[in-house]
């Protein structure tokens, strides 16, 4: 049935591991190594094994992976063909490289986090181990011949001569049975003869399709070729014991002459094309740290030279139900903080000779956006913001507040859900942005939640640079400069003129430019100029000036 894509296109249900080999390869029994888990913050380690038919259940000690608790995957059962999506419209080809990049958002791509990976610890460096792959069952190549004698079935009267011949890989067996049926219908067996004929196949015929597994010894750096046959064969020059040809050098051809007493000359001449040494390949994590939260990059690296023909080396990866045939793969649009399993193998002339299984945990993702509950000014110099934290892991908050072109940012503890802003400027619009961040392989900032408020009004500051000048005997010209801080919505200048303690003039203008006429001559006057912002008056600027005697 079709996998149901999640919002990202990748299902998150538990999955059975799918055996990688998709070719009818010569190699039969292959045991996958335990899946080695690697966290990208740790030194990269991997388990790769050459393929041994005996090595069907390799255990990994938890101690070998930083004393991590064992991560068990159970019951890898029968494998279904990956379900494939319906062909969409052809896409425009781009310049091809040898790197496979696949976005998990494609229809029906099934790249499942490994079982149990939804409850992932926040602790970087956590590791886990996984159980081994099951071994592919070996299909027996023999045919069982069953002959039923003494049948007493009630059949129409007739005589039948039946000859049954079965060919096995060991010998030709002729079974001839003559059964005569009487007119009454009862069966009478007159003769029964089973004879083996001495004719044998040639060893060249018998072992025409022999397959081989290459087993690598990391100490000696030599291969053993295991011949997949059902009987103990003999090799010319005694080159094999127990169907194994030992001490084969990488990238060298070896010729083996195979014979057995069940077959005749000519012998089978088997050319062993020995693969490169296993340790010359290393599975490398090529993920860019900036993208490690949603991408996985894996690449086989040749870390030493060898003389084998690189054209004969092929690489395979399987991640979920996606199969790749490149040396390097990139998977995109993955879930952060999830473990994904990829199996890979390298083949030489279609013989598997090494493989690795990786469980890769994607990095912490960018935290989600905090949800602002309210954001307002409660006084002229104060504001308050409250919020709910994002769901995803994060380390701290950054709160920035911007007035006009000025920006101030604060680092806030992850446990805070409210912050009081102090020392704000009155009657000023503040734009606030709040985002969570996490320090992972790199710092990842979550989306910022935004809000704004305008602080309350306050008294404006004093006008300045006030001047009083006489324009005639009984007239004065009063000017001043606007206050530095208006602190309110409106703009109005007031002038009060007092003689003694008596208010003689009270004027209001849009600008601080007053012409005061018809004053009394030779009188002391007090001039008070102040700014009013619609809510509050400012501190007055006070100057004293006297009119002169009339000149007339």
């Amino acid at each position: 049935q079709s996998p149901t894509p999640s919002p990202t296109g990748l299902t998150t249900a538990k999955m059975p591991s799918v055996p990688l080999s998709s070719d009818p390869l010569p190699t039969h029994t292959t045991a996958f190594s335990p899946a080695s888990t690697f966290e990208r913050e740790n030194d990269f380690s991997e388990t790769t094994t050459s393929l041994s038919p005996d090595n069907t259940s390799t255990q990994v000690s938890p101690d070998s992976l930083d004393n991590a608790s064992a991560f068990n995957t159970t019951g890898v059962s029968s494998v279904q063909t990956p379900h494939l999506p319906t062909h969409a419209d052809s896409q425009t080809p781009s310049a091809g490289t040898d790197t496979q990049t696949f976005s998990g958002s494609a229809a029906n791509a099934k790249l499942n986090p490994t079982p149990g990976s939804n409850a992932i610890s926040d602790v970087p460096g956590e590791r886990s181990t996984a159980s081994t792959f099951p071994t592919d069952p070996v299909s027996p190549l023999t045919t069982t011949l069953s002959l039923a004698h003494h049948s007493s079935a009630a059949l129409p009267a007739r005589t039948s001569n039946t000859t049954i011949t079965a060919n096995t890989s060991d010998a030709y067996l002729n079974a001839s049975e003559t059964t005569t049926l009487s007119p009454s219908g009862s069966a009478v067996i007159s003769t029964t003869t089973i004879a083996t004929t001495p004719s044998k196949p040639t060893c060249d015929e018998k072992y025409a399709n022999i397959t081989v597994d290459y087993l690598y010894n990391k100490e000696t750096k030599l291969f053993t070729a295991k011949l997949n046959v059902n009987e103990n064969v003999e090799c010319g020059n005694n080159t094999c014991t127990n169907n194994e040809v030992h001490n084969l050098t990488e990238c060298k051809n070896a010729s083996v002459s195979i014979s057995h007493n069940s077959c005749t000359a000519p012998d089978k001449t088997l050319i062993l094309d020995v693969p490169p040494g296993v340790e010359k390949f290393q599975l490398h994590d090529c993920t860019q740290v900036e993208k490690a939260d949603t991408t996985i990059c894996l690449k086989w690296k040749n870390i030493e030279t060898f003389t084998c023909d690189t054209q004969n080396i092929t690489y395979r990866f399987q991640c979920g139900n996606m199969i790749f045939d490149n040396k390097e793969i990139k998977l995109e649009n993955l879930e952060p903080e999830h473990e994904y399993k990829c199996d890979s193998e390298i083949l030489y002339n279609n013989h598997k000779f090494t493989n690795a299984s990786k469980i890769i945990k994607t990095d912490f993702g960018s935290p989600g956006e905090p949800q602002i509950i309210f954001c307002r000014s409660e006084a002229a110099h104060q504001g308050v913001i409250t919020w709910n934290p994002p769901q995803r892991s994060f380390h701290n908050f950054t709160l920035c507040y911007i007035k006009e072109t000025e920006k101030d940012c604060l680092n806030l503890d992850k446990n805070l859900i409210k912050y009081d802003l102090q020392n704000l400027k009155p009657y000023t619009k503040y734009v606030l942005s709040l985002h969570a961040y996490i320090i992972a392989k790199v710092q990842r900032n979550g989306s910022a939640a935004m809000c704004h408020f305008t602080t309350k009004s306050a008294p404006p500051s004093q006008v300045w640079n006030m001047t009083v000048s006489m324009t005639s005997d009984n007239s004065m010209h009063v000017k001043c400069r606007p206050p530095r801080d208006r602190n309110g919505p409106h703009e109005r200048y007031h002038l009060e003129v007092e003689a003694g303690n008596t208010l003689v003039r009270n004027e209001s203008h849009k600008n601080c430019d007053f012409r005061v006429k018809d004053l009394q001559y030779s009188t002391d006057y007090t001039f008070k100029a102040y700014f009013h912002n619609g809510d509050y008056p400012g501190e007055p600027f006070i100057l004293h000036h006297s009119t002169s005697y009339n000149s007339k």
Partner: nanobody, 126 residues
Framework: EVQLVESGGGLVQAGDSLRLSCAAS????????LAWFRQAPGKEREFVAS?????????HYGDSVKGRFTISRDNGKNTVALQMNNLKPEDTAVYFC??????????????????WGQGTQVTISS
């Protein structure tokens, strides 16, 4: 202009063999993959086999055809063949040849392929 033309389909008995051929023209990039997909009536398109055009033996098969089908290439003639042995009634489908010039997606997904042939009908009678 890229063209893929399939041939070799037909009606055969269960257990028989059939060989399909796909002639590719207009593909200039040697880095490409050719594949066979099939689609039975009322079913989704299914991956059958793929082969890389350059390099060593790099072939893949769908689980249902492993051991029975063999994909091969003839670079000189620009053709890809699918040898189908021991055919079963469930192999009845329209077989499509496909080519990918961007090797940036899983080889067993039809969305990974850029060019498609018209298809050839294969019918297996029991």
């Amino acid at each position: 202009e890229v063209q893929l033309v399939e041939s070799g389909g037909g009606l055969v008995q269960a257990g028989d063999s059939l060989r399909l051929s796909c002639a590719a023209s207009g593909l200039t990039n040697p880095e490409r993959r050719l594949a066979w997909f099939r689609q039975a009536p009322g079913k989704e398109r299914e991956f059958v086999a793929s082969i890389r055009w350059s390099g060593g033996p790099n072939t893949h098969y769908g689980d249902s055809v492993k051991g029975r089908f063999t994909i091969s290439r003839d670079n000189g003639k620009n053709t890809v063949a699918l040898q189908m042995n021991n055919l079963k009634p469930e192999d009845t489908a329209v077989y499509f040849c496909a080519a990918a010039v961007r090797l940036t997606a899983p080889l067993n997904f039809d969305t990974s392929y850029d060019y498609w042939g018209q298809g050839t009908q294969v019918t297996i009678s029991s």
